[in-house]
C-alpha cells in the first residue's frame, strides 16, 4: 500500500511516457491520474517499468475500478496482466476474442497459470459455449487445452468447433474425454468423402464404439498402430482376429511389438490360439 502524498510541483503526469520510469513509487501514486492511465494503457507496455512500479499502476486501476476493469482497459493491460490475481480476473467481463488473444500473448511460452485459466473460464462462460474461433485461439496457445477440460465441460463444445482441433490437441485426452468428443467429430465430419473423413476422424477414434471399428475394418482403412493403441479396450475386445487384420491392413505386423501393452495384450487373451496363428506373428494367447 502506497502512502498518500501530494505530487511535487511540475511532476504531474500529462501523459503516460518514458519519463515516468524515473518516478519513485510514491511519485507515481501521487502524480499519475488513474483516469489518464486507463485511457493510455496501451502505452504502458512500451515503457520499461519495474515490477514495483507496475504494482503502483495496478493499485491505481484497482481504486478507479473496484468492481472490475472495463474491457477497454483489459485489452491493453499487456504485462500488467501478469500482476493480476484470479480474484481480480473474476470481476472482469471479457467478451472480445481480440482481448483474449492480447492477454494470452503476454503469457505465451509459459505454462497455463491460474490467472490464464480464470481468464479463459470467464471468457468461455461469457460466450456460453466453446465456439470454433475460441477453440482455435486457445489450442494455438495451449495445445493441451482441450484435454484439460472435464467431460462435462467438453459436452458444451459444439460439433462445428471440432474443425479447429488438430491431432496434437488430443494427445493428452483420456478415454472419457474422447467418448464425448468422438460423436461430435462424427457429426462435424459426416459429409466428408471417405479417405478425407478417415484422416479427420482418426485422432478421435479413441472414443469409437466396437460397431464403428467393425464397419471400418471392412473398408480398407489401414489404421496405423499408434491409432490402434489409443482405441478403447472395451471396443477392441469383441473384434475378431480377421477384423483386426482387416482394420490394420499392412500394419498388422506391428501387433507383435505391442503384445504386452493394452489394448493388444487384453485382446490377444480373448482370442483362440488357432485364430491368432493365422496372423503368423507368433502371438501367444
Amino acid at each position: 500500500e502506497v502512502e498518500k502524498t501530494a505530487c511535487p510541483s511540475g511532476k504531474k503526469a500529462r501523459e503516460i511516457d518514458e519519463s515516468l520510469i524515473f518516478y519513485k513509487k510514491w511519485e507515481l501514486e501521487a502524480c499519475v491520474d488513474a483516469a489518464l492511465l486507463a485511457t493510455q494503457m496501451d502505452r504502458v507496455n512500451a515503457i520499461p517499468f519495474t515490477y514495483e512500479q507496475l504494482d503502483v499502476l495496478k493499485h491505481k486501476l484497482d481504486e478507479l475500478y473496484p468492481q472490475g476493469y472495463p474491457e477497454s482497459v483489459i485489452q491493453h493491460l499487456g504485462y500488467l496482466f501478469l500482476k493480476m490475481s484470479p480474484e481480480d480476473i473474476r470481476k472482469w467481463n471479457v467478451t472480445s476474442l481480440e482481448t483474449l488473444k492480447a492477454l494470452l500473448e503476454v503469457n505465451k511460452g509459459h505454462e497455463m497459470s491460474p490467472q490464464v485459466a480464470t481468464l479463459i473460464d470467464r471468457f468461455v462462460k461469457g460466450r456460453g459455449q466453446l465456439d470454433k474461433d475460441t477453440l482455435d485461439t486457445l489450442t494455438a496457445f495451449y495445445p493441451g487445452y482441450l484435454c484439460s477440460l472435464s467431460p462435462e465441460e467438453l459436452s458444451s463444445v459444439p460439433p462445428s468447433s471440432i474443425w479447429a482441433v488438430r491431432p496434437q490437441d488430443l494427445d493428452t485426452c483420456d478415454p472419457r474425454q474422447l467418448d464425448v468428443l468422438y460423436p461430435k467429430a462424427r457429426l462435424a465430419f459426416q459429409n466428408m468423402n471417405g479417405s478425407e473423413y478417415f484422416v479427420k476422424i482418426q485422432s478421435f477414434l479413441g472414443g469409437a464404439p466396437t460397431e464403428d471399428l467393425k464397419a471400418l475394418s471392412q473398408q480398407n482403412v489401414s489404421m496405423d498402430l499408434a491409432t490402434f493403441m489409443k482405441l478403447r479396450t472395451d471396443a477392441v475386445l469383441p473384434l475378431t482376429v480377421a477384423e483386426v487384420q482387416k482394420l490394420l491392413g499392412p500394419h498388422v505386423e506391428g501387433l507383435k511389438a505391442e503384445e504386452r501393452h493394452r489394448p493388444v495384450r487384453d485382446w490377444i487373451l480373448r482370442q483362440r490360439q488357432d485364430d491368432l496363428d493365422t496372423l503368423g506373428l507368433g502371438l501367444q494367447g
Partner: nanobody
Framework: QVRLVESGGGSVQAGGSLRLSCAAS????????MGWFRQAPGKEREGVAS????????NYADSVRGRFTISQDNAKNTLYLQMNSLKPEDTAMYYC?????????????????????WGQGTQVTVSS
C-alpha cells in the same frame, strides 16, 4: 450406439401392401447406411434394400425392385419400407440394420455381413 426397433409387420393377402418402420435411437449420422433384410424359415438372411443416410443412394435386390421402396425421415430418425404387390415368397422375418460408418455410398449395398447393428425383426406373412 444405434438401437433399431422395427414395426408394421403383419399378415396380408397376395397383391396387398404393408409399410414397415424402423425407429433408430442413438446417434444417426449422414455417413451411415441403413437397410432392410429378410429371412424366411430355413433360408439365409438376404438383403432387400438399403439407403445412404446422407441421401443420394438407394439399392434394391432384384427380387423386390419396382415393388418395394426404401425411404427415410431424418427428422424422426426413422427408416421405412413400402411393400406393394406382395407375393407369398415375400413371407419372412424382416430386419432393419445399420452400418454405423460408411466411407463411401457404394459400401451401403444390402450385404448382410457388412451391417453391424440389427433390430429384433418384424414378421410379414403373405398368403395366396
Amino acid at each position: 450406439q444405434v438401437r433399431l426397433v422395427e414395426s408394421g409387420g403383419g399378415s396380408v393377402q397376395a397383391g396387398g401392401s404393408l409399410r414397415l418402420s424402423c425407429a433408430a435411437s442413438g446417434n444417426v449420422y449422414n455417413n451411415m447406411c441403413m437397410g432392410w433384410f429378410r429371412q424366411a424359415p430355413g433360408k439365409e438372411r438376404e438383403g432387400v434394400a438399403s439407403i445412404y443416410v446422407g441421401g443420394g443412394y438407394t439399392n434394391y435386390a432384384d427380387s423386390v425392385r419396382g415393388r418395394f421402396t426404401i425411404s427415410q425421415d431424418n427428422a424422426k430418425n426413422t427408416l421405412y419400407l413400402q411393400m406393394n404387390s406382395l407375393k407369398p415368397e415375400d413371407t419372412a422375418m424382416y430386419y432393419c440394420a445399420a452400418i454405423t460408418v460408411a466411407l463411401t455410398r457404394a459400401f451401403c449395398a444390402p450385404i448382410p455381413s457388412r451391417y453391424t447393428n440389427w433390430g429384433q425383426g418384424t414378421q410379414v406373412t403373405v398368403s395366396s
